[in-house]
């Protein structure tokens, strides 16, 4: 007699064969906070931007990607202390002379009002109230994200 | 009448409430190759190491972490062309003067026989036959990994 979970594995596997859908997260892992269709993890330790990116990656997640001003505000509402900074997945691309998300897309200039310089070795952090350009070597906290809902036919081409 | 998949969501969610287990991958997403308890994605495009790390992260995966010589050999067996290099999740930490995996652990010197220098801005690539130290700015292919099996009580403390 199979448990319901074992039966689920079979059901989902058969479903995936038809739809090429990967299971996705059904709800957020322990310690992660749900914000709409994402799970967010706010670090308690500090790291430069690069190490923060690596940490999210080893957690099979991404440094936070913010779609629009609305998502920024909702994320900032989860930050308790006004002075604390958190890395997100946005840094300055010297070759393209533009702010670039780690998924390869460029910042829509209307989305975030960045305080500070757009220059080499600059990465973006958010606080409870603002968005700042900081040296990427600065050691601050960071936010990882996981997509919560499974997406049908979600595939992973190269960026 | 709920579909079997909808019922599964409920079953798995109830199960997770008891076990703090996150669903995990039941099998590999399309385009990913299974190697034991991992899913691997071999890129077809090229990138410097940092961009490769970012790409894996946005795919909610990690640059390849290799546990031991055995896993290295099995991974290399999946590489078809002798001349092609792939970034993995290992680079040189200048402050600690040592090879460091992106999960924060240091390389066990017996695990990989690295050809090339251990110095600033050096990152590790693998080919079908060898392990090389390359400038991190070198644009080559890369390998992302996802853990395949759900791990009970898997939590994500800061690195």
């Amino acid at each position: 007699q199979k448990s319901s979970i074992e039966k689920c594995s079979v059901d989902i596997q058969q479903s995936r064969n038809k739809t090429t859908e990967r299971p996705g997260l059904l709800n957020c892992p322990i310690y992660w906070q749900q914000l709409r269709e994402k799970c967010l993890l706010f670090s308690h330790t500090v790291n430069p931007w690069n190490n923060s990116l690596a940490d999210c990656s080893t957690k099979e997640s991404s440094l936070l990607l913010i779609r629009d001003k609305d998502e920024l505000i909702h994320t900032q509402n989860l930050i308790r202390d006004k002075a604390i900074l958190f890395w997100i997945g946005l840094n300055f691309s010297l070759s393209e002379k533009n702010w670039k998300w780690i998924n390869g897309s460029f910042l829509n200039s209307n989305d975030l009002e960045i305080r500070g310089d757009a220059k080499e070795n600059s990465c973006i952090s958010i606080s409870q109230t603002s968005v700042y350009s900081e040296y990427c070597s600065t050691e601050i906290r960071w936010i990882c994200q996981k997509e919560l809902t499974p997406v049908r036919n979600k595939v992973y081409p190269d960026s | 009448q709920k579909s079997s998949i909808e019922k599964c969501s409920v079953d798995i969610q109830q199960s997770r409430n008891k076990t703090t287990e996150r669903p995990g991958l039941l099998n590999c997403p399309i385009y990913w190759q299974q190697l034991r308890e991992k899913c691997l994605l071999f890129s077809h495009t090229v990138n410097p190491w940092n961009n490769s790390l970012a790409d894996c992260s946005t795919k909610e995966s990690s640059l390849l972490l290799i546990r031991d010589k055995d896993e290295l050999i099995h991974t290399q067996n999946l590489i078809r062309d002798k001349a092609i290099l792939f970034w993995i999740g290992l680079n040189f930490s200048l402050s600690e003067k040592n090879w460091k995996w992106i999960n924060g652990s240091f390389l066990n010197s017996n695990d990989l026989e690295i050809r090339g220098d251990a110095k600033e801005n050096s990152c590790i690539s693998i080919s079908q036959t060898s392990v090389y130290s390359e400038y991190c700015s070198t644009e080559i292919r890369w390998i992302c990994q996802k853990e395949l099996t759900p791990v009970r009580n898997k939590v994500y403390p800061d690195s």
Partner: antibody, heavy 122, light 108 residues
Framework: QVQLVESGGGLVKPGGSLRLSCAAS????????MSWIRQAPGKGLEWVSY????????AYADSVKGRFTISRDNAKNSLYLQMNSLRAEDTAVYYC???????????????WGRGTLVTVSS | DIQLTQSPSSVSASVGDRVTITCRAS??????LAWYQQKPGKAPKLLIY???SLQSGVPSRFSGSGSGTDFTLTISSLQPEDFATYYC??????????FGGGTKVEIK
């Protein structure tokens, strides 16, 4: 309890050297930016140097650049200031200070030691 | 370098008085400003950070305001233990992290 204790101050001749130490306890030292700040007798406060949590990033005030070296040993919960080529104008109480966590290089000093007096005189 | 000018340099006040100290930056520093209290022979103590956030354990009679170049520290009702020297400090991400010249609050 949470505290910082400086040591190593004293009387030194111009051109001489001193090494200040700061012992931290009661908090996770390796997660904080640490600084040295000084105060000349009867004067205001002057930031001297900072070091990032990992020790990878360091900065100095122009007045001490090339003469002072900041360092840390996270395993020993200790901060250091090596002072060379000392001048009369370096005479001051030297404070070790911790910055609020996770504000990066925006250094708000939320914990201070009691200070150690350095006197440079012939 | 960013200069901070505090005024007044000293103020005489009585217990229960409302005291206001201002700090002006030579260029805009957003909200990257702190206020400290220092008593003779003691280390400074952080009162306010991020221009208006009250540091843990600091009495609510202390408050900070301002943004850009002009900032204010207010003590709503002066207590005997508040007689001290007060310093502002700018903490933009670029060193040096300059302090104001100080304001001495004395007993009238």
């Amino acid at each position: 309890q949470v505290q910082l204790v400086e040591s190593g101050g004293g009387l030194v001749k111009p051109g001489g050297s001193l090494r200040l130490s700061c012992a931290a306890s009661g908090f996770t030292f390796s997660q904080y930016y640490m600084s040295w700040i000084r105060q000349a007798p009867g004067k205001g406060l002057e930031w001297v140097s900072y070091i990032s949590p990992s020790g990878a990033t360091i900065a100095y005030a122009d007045s001490v650049k090339g003469r002072f070296t900041i360092s840390r040993d996270n395993a020993k919960n200790s901060l250091y200031l090596q002072m060379n080529s000392l001048r009369a104008e370096d005479t001051a109480v030297y404070y070790c200070a911790r910055s609020l966590m996770a504000t990066g290089t925006h250094l708000y000093f939320d914990l201070w030691g009691r200070g150690t007096l350095v006197t440079v005189s012939s | 370098d960013i200069q901070l000018t505090q005024s007044p340099s000293s103020v005489s006040a009585s217990v229960g008085d409302r005291v206001t100290i201002t700090c002006r930056a030579s260029q805009g520093i957003s909200s990257w400003l702190a206020w400290y209290q220092q008593k003779p022979g003691k280390a400074p103590k952080l009162l306010i950070y991020a221009a208006e956030s009250l540091q843990s354990g600091v009495p609510s009679r202390f408050s900070g305001s301002g943004s850009g170049t002009d900032f204010t520290l207010t003590i709503s009702s002066l207590q005997p233990e508040d007689f001290a020297t007060y310093y502002c400090q700018q903490v933009t991400s670029q060193p040096p992290y300059t302090f104001g010249g100080g304001t001495k609050v004395e007993i009238k």
